[in-house]
């Protein structure tokens, strides 16, 4: 399992280190989740050939995974702190149903999948404290999420494997873009 935030496994022991700022804590939290995703992807790629599949574009079209776009204000051109923060929080809330789907998809990394899910909830809380305009954040409808989850779980084995691969990859990309944007805030 990845080292919990605040105990960066790669860190050289730094004596008299100042307490982490809110931004650094968020940064560490995202890195912790990214480490977890890497471990899950390792199992997924070892178990199936999804990571090299050329058919992923077909499957991706059926998933409405959150993505960063220029209008979200998270890129350098047109960077807008508040718009971007709303997009990041909204995107993470939208990913939660997909992270729930991942919970029964791993054999040897079951704990890791749970850690990614729980750490994402903590990250959302951190970010909500940072946001000024909480009203602009739309929470996904629980009924819609429940039916999406049922639909995903009813897919055949190949599609389930592909869905798992795509969720992990898209979530990683979303977090990487979020990390870069949050550093500028």
């Amino acid at each position: 399992a990845p080292v919990p935030p605040g105990e960066d496994s790669k860190d050289v022991a730094a004596p008299h280190r100042q307490p982490l700022t809110s931004s650094e804590r968020i940064d560490k939290q995202i890195r912790y989740i990214l480490d977890g995703i890497s471990a899950l992807r390792k199992e997924t790629c070892n178990k199936s050939n999804m990571c090299e599949s050329s058919k992923e574009a077909l499957a991706e079209n059926n998933l409405n995974l959150p993505k960063m776009a220029e209008k979200d204000g998270c890129f350098q051109s047109g960077f807008n702190e508040e718009t971007c923060l709303v997009k990041i929080i909204t995107g993470l809330l939208e990913f939660e149903v997909y992270l729930e789907y991942l919970q029964n998809r791993f054999e040897s990394s079951e704990e890791q999948a749970r850690a990614v899910q729980m750490s994402t909830k903590v990250l959302i809380q951190f970010l909500q404290k940072k946001a000024k305009n909480l009203d602009a954040i739309t929470t996904p409808d629980p009924t819609t999420n429940a039916s999406l989850l049922t639909k995903l779980q009813a897919q055949n084995q190949w599609l389930q494997d592909m869905t798992t691969h795509l969720i992990l990859r898209s979530f990683k990309e979303f977090l990487q873009s979020s990390l870069r944007a949050l550093r500028q805030m």
Partner: antibody, heavy 116, light 107 residues
């Protein structure tokens, strides 16, 4: 082992367009940001800009009006175009992979000379 | 843009010496700083990221410290292969910016 291999014209005349390409071998292309950095002879490093596999870009404002960075995901390649070059654009141009923190893998560098 | 200022711009030292290079950012950058080593005619090589984390494969005689605006790269016992130019770089915001470099020469 990830490697970056770059190529392009090394000698240009003023007002021409510099064009370089960088190919990524042995690693995931879509999970990193890919940058161009230059170094004039005997001077320091200057970041030009970066691209993600999706095509989203960030450019150095000092060069933005002349720079285009593009990506070809089918070939795991990204390219730099710098228009209206002058002698001040003479430099070694590097492509590099930006991890979450730093430029951890670099191309071998291409010396570009602008001279009439 | 965030300006990065390194000092000294060059220094002379002997094998076995302890060497310290400083880097100052024009505004706070938290711990989002990297250090690179560059040898003549070669591409830069990443040494340290996040101000104090050692890149894998980099000898432990290299260490980094600092947060906010002031950062330090220390080589605890200079080796012959360490004579090179060192650059700091911030990645808090765009554009990414580098220090002007510190050349470590043989005394």
């Amino acid at each position: 082992q990830v490697q970056l291999q770059q190529w392009g014209a090394g000698l240009l005349k003023p007002s021409e367009t510099l064009s370089l390409t960088c190919a990524v071998y042995g690693g995931s292309f879509r999970e990193y940001y890919w940058s161009w950095i230059r170094q004039p002879p005997g001077k320091g490093l200057e970041w030009i800009g970066e691209i993600f596999h999706s095509g989203s870009t960030n450019y150095n404002p000092s060069l933005k009006s002349r720079v285009t960075i593009s990506v070809d995901t089918s070939k795991n390649q990204f390219s730099l175009k710098l228009s209206s070059v002058t002698a001040a654009d003479t430099a070694v141009y590097y492509c590099a992979r930006e991890e979450l923190d730093d430029f951890d893998i670099w191309g071998q560098g291409t010396m570009v000379t602008v001279s009439s | 843009d965030i300006q990065m200022t390194q000092s000294p711009s060059s220094l002379s030292a002997s094998v076995g010496d302890r060497v310290t290079i400083t880097c100052r950012a024009s505004q706070g950058i938290s711990s989002w700083l990297a250090w690179y080593q560059q040898k003549p005619e070669k591409a830069p090589k990443s040494l340290i990221y996040a101000a104090s984390s050692l890149q894998s494969g980099v000898p432990s005689r290299f260490s980094g410290s600092g947060s906010g605006t002031d950062f330090t790269l220390t080589i605890s016992s200079l080796q012959p292969e360490d004579f090179a130019t060192y650059y700091c770089q911030q990645y808090k915001s765009y554009p990414r910016t580098f220090g002007q470099g510190t050349k470590v020469e043989i005394k």
